[in-house]
């Protein structure tokens, strides 16, 4: 049974050219986090795997930094970065938890 909940930074805004931290936190469960995926619509941004560590997709490597923690830092923001971002927590034995963050990049 999945008892956990994902807390996120919710709806956030940032200035063009600036940076922002995308953060999710899994609480109310003792499940082990085995992997966290960060995605934007159908694009894979980054993965943090418990055994393999961090992987940033090549197309985002120059603008995305891992952390803090299981979060993700987006840098050199453009208006095209406006949209939905998702953290997907793969856990054992619970299964998968998903959090949503909406980012608005201001001119």
């Amino acid at each position: 049974m999945m008892t956990g909940t994902i807390e996120t930074t919710g709806n956030i805004s940032a200035e063009k050219g600036g940076s922002i931290i995308l953060q999710c936190h899994l609480s109310s469960t003792t499940a082990q986090v085995t992997q966290v995926n960060w995605e934007q619509q159908d694009q894979l941004l980054a993965i943090c795997n418990a055994d393999l560590g961090w992987h940033i997709s090549p197309s985002f490597k120059d603008r995305v930094a891992p952390g803090p923690g299981l979060g993700l830092t987006l840098q050199s923001l453009t208006v095209n970065d406006t949209g939905e971002y998702f953290c997907i927590y793969h856990t054992y034995p619970d299964g998968t938890y998903t959090g949503r963050i909406f980012l608005e990049v201001l001119e």
Epitope: E39, Q41, D42, L44, I47, N49, L52, F86, I88, H90
Partner: antibody
Amino acid sequence: QVQLQESGPGLVKPSQTLSLTCTVTGSSITSDYAWNWIRQFPGKKLEWMGYITYSGRTTYNPSLKSRITISRDTSKNQFSLKLSSVTAADTATYYCARWGLLRRYFDYWGQGTLLTVSS
Amino acid sequence: DIVMTQSPSSMSTSVGDRVTITCRASQDVFNQVAWYQQKPGKSPKLLIYSASFRYTGVPDRFSGSGSGTDFTFTISSVQAEDFATYYCQQHYSTPLTFGAGTKLELK
């Protein structure tokens, strides 16, 4: 229970346009998934053709980009494939499948429909 | 496109045997590889995703491992119902691509 069901003509003449429809039950095509077409050639090779997301955005295999269109009818909870200028090389079993945008795998597939291109 | 090279193309085995199938990606896909089972006249069925994560309800005799470009799928003790064709697939980036398949036959 999520189910996908392909429907189409079975036989298409060369140079014509192939049209297939996938009817989805147990899951809304406007929920957080991408709705795919995948084909399997007689030699059993699988080829991903493209998808339409819950928001209506399409992504196609570049090898088919000039010939393929995927569209949807949300009122009927259906999505469709059109492939133009078909040849015998397009003879295959065509599957529709659900791809979890946030899960990154095909979790549900239709049973497949065999489409033959022949005059 | 990312090419998935799967081997062997077929193999003969007996019930109770351990079986290993390999898949090599033409470029780094981190751990974004899935494995499917297909029986004659049926559609493919998901077994493993993210290289090593068993899908819901999949028996634990099926396992996967690997990262980067080299991946392995193992059946620890083949059962009668496991004779089928197995495919690897990269779910790292579009176009999504599959291996050519490995047909598991009864010796």
